[in-house]
Interface confidence: medium
């Protein structure tokens, strides 16, 4: 039985050229997190954090994606094309798979505030 819930940073905004942290947190379960996959809106994999084998950043994103903090992901040198949905998928044992959603809006405005809050999607 899957008892856990994924908390995410929800809807966030950041300015073009800046950076943003994508964070998910799995709670309310004793399941062991084996792997976290980070996907972009078009379902392409950005990165994988395997509990045993470590981080793997996919080649297309190597220059703009940094692992962490924790199981999260830092996107750098943001462009307008980065606007969209991001998904964290937690593969756990024995529960199975949990999935969280974050919506990132990249703003042209230099006064764009980086806003982030944890919420349950």
């Amino acid at each position: 039985m899957m008892t856990g819930t994924i908390e995410t940073t929800g809807n966030i905004s950041a300015k073009k050229g800046g950076s943003v942290i994508l964070q998910c947190h799995l709670s309310s379960t004793m399941a062991q997190v084996t792997q976290v996959n980070w996907e972009q809106h078009d379902h392409s994999l950005l990165a994988i954090r395997n509990a045993e084998l470590g981080w793997h950043i996919y080649p297309a994103f190597k220059d703009r994606v940094a692992p962490g903090p924790g199981l999260g992901l830092t996107l750098q040198s943001l462009t307008m094309n980065d606007t969209g949905e991001y998904f964290c998928t937690y593969h756990t044992y024995p529960d199975g798979t949990y999935r969280g959603r974050i919506f990132l809006e990249v703003l042209e405005s230099s006064v764009a505030e980086h806003s982030a809050r944890f919420q349950i999607p």
């Epitope: 062991q32 084996t34 792997q35 996959n37 996907e39 994999l45 395997n50 045993e52 084998l53 793997h56 998928t89 593969h91 044992y93 024995p94």
Partner: antibody, heavy 127, light 107 residues
Framework: EVQLVESGGGLVQPGGSLRLSCAAS????????MSWVRQAPGKGLEWVAN????????YYVDSVKGRFTISRDNAKNSLYLQMNSLRAEDTAVYYC????????????????????WGQGTLVTVSS | EIVLTQSPATLSLSPGERATLSCRAS??????LAWYQQKPGQAPRLLIY???KRATGIPARFSGSGSGTDFTLTISSLEPEDFAVYYC?????????FGGGTKVEIK
């Protein structure tokens, strides 16, 4: 820190039996698949057997089927290999290896790699 | 059974040189291939998993590539501690199999 310590190796005559043990520590033993891998003197690696987390599924290389039995005791954090009808060609260092799981989202399946190994125990089958 | 053939059997190189090791599978293993390093008297060490991903703590000079039946392990610039035997292993299906190994020795 993950630790795997094999024991039970030694000299045995052809046709004899031996039981190898692997004591695991530093991780939740019941959450991981385990394998035995062997290496004959001066030769390459050969996977021998695999057992799932709860012991429900077991796999063997053809050359040991019907002679070797892999088992585990999750309460004791231990893995075993019962070896019967031993042959000269079973002479090798036997390693206990723990699986690390990788999820391939493009194919929706888990892959199992051996990231943690013991230091091995030598089994010599000779008359 | 999937047979893995490694070549060359022995590679004689000097420190600082580039090493290219090959592993060929008798049938497709997709990307389910690992590379291990083994030194005399020691257990194998996982270097690469899923054909191209470096395991935790493995230096960037080690890289893997390929999919299907043809795979390559590249060591961009050999360090003295890299001289060892390297094995590929497929985890696509049982029985799991290893290649025969490639020994990288000092020239």
């Amino acid at each position: 820190e993950v630790q795997l310590v094999e024991s039970g190796g030694g000299l045995v005559q052809p046709g004899g039996s031996l039981r190898l043990s692997c004591a695991a520590s530093g991780f939740t033993f019941s959450s991981y698949g385990m394998s035995w891998v062997r290496q004959a003197p001066g030769k390459g690696l050969e996977w021998v057997a695999n057992i799932k987390q709860d012991g429900s599924e077991k796999y063997y290389v053809d050359s040991v089927k019907g002679r070797f039995t892999i088992s585990r005791d999750n309460a004791k954090n231990s893995l075993y290999l019962q070896m019967n009808s031993l042959r000269a060609e079973d002479t090798a260092v036997y390693y206990c290896a723990r699986v690390s799981y990788y999820y391939d989202s493009s194919k929706l399946r888990w892959a199992e790699y051996f990231q943690h190994w013991g230091q091995g125990t030598l089994v010599t089958v000779s008359s | 059974e999937i047979v893995l053939t490694q070549s060359p059997a022995t590679l004689s190189l000097s420190p600082g040189e580039r090493a290219t090791l090959s592993c060929r599978a008798s049938q497709s293993v997709s990307s389910y291939l690992a590379w291990y390093q083994q030194k005399p008297g020691q257990a194998p060490r996982l270097l690469i998993y899923d054909a191209s991903k470096r395991a935790t703590g493995i230096p960037a000079r080690f890289s893997g590539s390929g999919s299907g039946t043809d795979f390559t392990l590249t060591i961009s610039s050999l360090e003295p501690e890299d001289f060892a035997v390297y094995y590929c292993q497929q985890v696509h299906n049982f029985p799991l199999t290893f290649g025969g190994g490639t020994k990288v020795e000092i020239k």
